[in-house]
């Protein structure tokens, strides 16, 4: 019953955190114009990673697609492939892992089937969470250091007649949006892989010994009990586990609202 | 068609008050900006400030901050720039605008003239 | 807060010539997230509210006569009437459409030689 719930929970939690990567993949706010002293602007700023938009207190909003694959950035191309790396394996991830779930039965799978899905689904899980975290933390790694640099410009090209209004930008909502995401992603896979160890069979169940005494006739069965958690102080008859299938993390190499005043 | 309607030319005293309306149709009132501009004779125009009909949410212009309140009326599709403590200086004419893209006034009020004579 | 300069002050073209007015901006109004600045003209004669003729810089307003076309980038600006006609004079006024507050140039009064 607990292997069940957590592995039902496992499932649930990362079906959530993968539509958030989804979600934060989508988005466009990952980063925003940052308001510091003026919380009222004519003209609002914020990119993704896949368009840029500019919203105008008149309500007007305009998105611009980056129609260049070569012009961008390398870091933006490198968060681009993790985010959908994290994706892709998320998507796998929740395939293997239906057919993994317990309480689901297809056919005549065996347990042992059921334990290495469930493994495979749950690394799947991790590293998809992590694809995410690291995507989204480049990307704020990134964005910190061109928020410093565009301040270190404001205050040193004030000498002239003519100040150009520097654009800076701040964390938008994907960010944490990508950041949470990953995280319940993750929590689900280490769940899964903690269901897993309920899920193993046991090499060996001995039979039951009858031993037959004379005046009494008493039945008892030494070790006839089925390690159900995976938990229990009976190691000698668990089967250890060998973690099953393994997946490889193929990370390939690889900007900005109140009614919107 | 759209069209923003003002109230009359007022005439006050200093230190009274004055209440400016501009009665807007033709249009969706609460998905527009109204903004109000004054023009001094001879002076180039001031932005006094706005607000958005649909929250009520407003922002002035620092000069005219405690100077110009702007409210509304959402049934009556009127906004309202009340004016204190009148003084010469506020001797002007005040349009209602309404925003549209690029941040522009494509709608004037034809503007209330405000004249504070003791 | 951001002063827009107009230049000249006033200007007398005759009918049919070309008329250029001048805006100058203390600060850019060119928006780096889509490309454009926001400057608008306006147009305002004697006892009426203003006119809005082109917005964005560069974009006309629908109803406006393409006689009329605005340019520039940053920080300078600048109106055009291709042909100037008789029902043109009036005060043109720039505006910083960019940042609040929203300020406007002091006017230029065009008049007909």
């Known amino acids: 019953m607990a292997v069940t719930a957590c592995q039902g929970l496992g499932f649930v939690v990362s079906l959530i955190g993968i539509a958030g990567i989804i979600a934060a993949t989508c988005m466009d706010q990952w980063s925003t114009q940052d308001l510091y002293n003026n919380p009222v602007t004519a003209v609002f700023n914020y990119q993704g990673l896949w368009r840029s938009c500019v919203r105008e207190s008149s309500g007007f909003t305009e998105c611009r697609g980056y129609f260049t694959l070569l012009g961008l950035p390398a870091m933006l191309q490198a968060v681009r492939a993790l985010m959908i790396v994290g994706i892709v394996l998320g998507a796998i991830g929740l395939l293997v892992s239906i057919f993994a779930l317990k309480c689901i039965r297809i056919g005549s799978m065996e347990d042992s089937a059921k334990a290495n899905m469930t493994l495979t689904s749950g690394i799947m899980f991790i590293v998809s969470g992590l694809c995410a975290i690291a995507g989204v933390s480049v990307f704020a790694n990134m964005l910190v250091t061109n928020f410093w640099m565009s301040t270190a410009n404001m205050y040193t090209g004030m000498g002239g007649m003519v100040q150009t209004v520097q654009t800076r930008y701040t964390f938008g909502a994907a960010l944490f949006v990508g950041w949470v995401a990953g995280g319940l992603t993750l929590i689900g896979g280490v769940m899964m892989c903690i269901a897993c160890r309920g899920l193993a069979p046991e090499e060996t169940n001995y039979k039951a010994v009858s031993y037959h005494a004379s005046g009494h006739s008493v039945a008892y069965k030494p070790g006839g009990f089925k390690a159900s958690t995976g938990f229990g102080s009976n190691t000698k008859n668990k089967k250890i586990y060998d973690g099953g299938a393994r997946t490889e993390d193929e990370v390939q190499s690889y900007p900005s609202k109140h009614d919107y005043v | 068609e759209v069209q923003l309607v003002q109230s009359g030319a007022e005439v006050k005293k200093p230190g009274a008050s004055v209440k400016v309306s501009c009665k807007a149709s033709g249009y969706t009132f609460t998905s527009y900006w109204m903004h109000w501009v004054k023009q001094r004779p001879g002076q180039r125009l001031e932005w006094i400030g706005m607000?958005?009909?649909?929250?009520?949410?407003?922002n002035y212009n620092e000069k005219f901050k405690g100077k110009a309140t702007l409210t509304l009326d959402k049934s009556a599709s009127t906004a309202y720039m009340e004016l204190s403590s009148l003084r010469s200086e506020d001797t002007a004419v005040y349009y209602c605008?309404?925003?549209?893209?690029?941040?522009?006034?494509?709608?004037w009020g034809q503007g209330t003239t405000v004249t504070v004579s003791s | 807060d951001i002063v827009l300069t107009q230049s000249p002050d006033s200007l007398a073209v005759s009918l049919g010539e070309r008329a250029t007015i001048n805006c100058k901006s203390s600060q850019s109004l060119l928006n780096s997230g889509n490309q454009k600045n926001y400057l608008t003209w306006y147009q305002q004669k004697p006892g009426q509210p203003p006119k809005l003729l082109i917005y964005?810089?560069?974009t006309r307003e629908s109803g406006v006569p393409d006689r009329f076309s605005g340019s520039g980038s940053g920080t300078d600006f600048t109106l055009t009437i291709s042909s100037l006609q008789a029902e043109d004079v009036a005060v043109y006024y720039c505006q910083n459409a960019y940042t609040y507050p929203f300020t406007f140039g002091q006017g230029t009064k065009l008049e007909i030689k």
């Open positions: 607000i958005h009909p649909n929250s009520g949410s407003t």
């Open positions: 964005w810089a560069s």
């Open positions: 605008a309404r925003l549209k893209t690029g941040n522009s006034f494509d709608y």
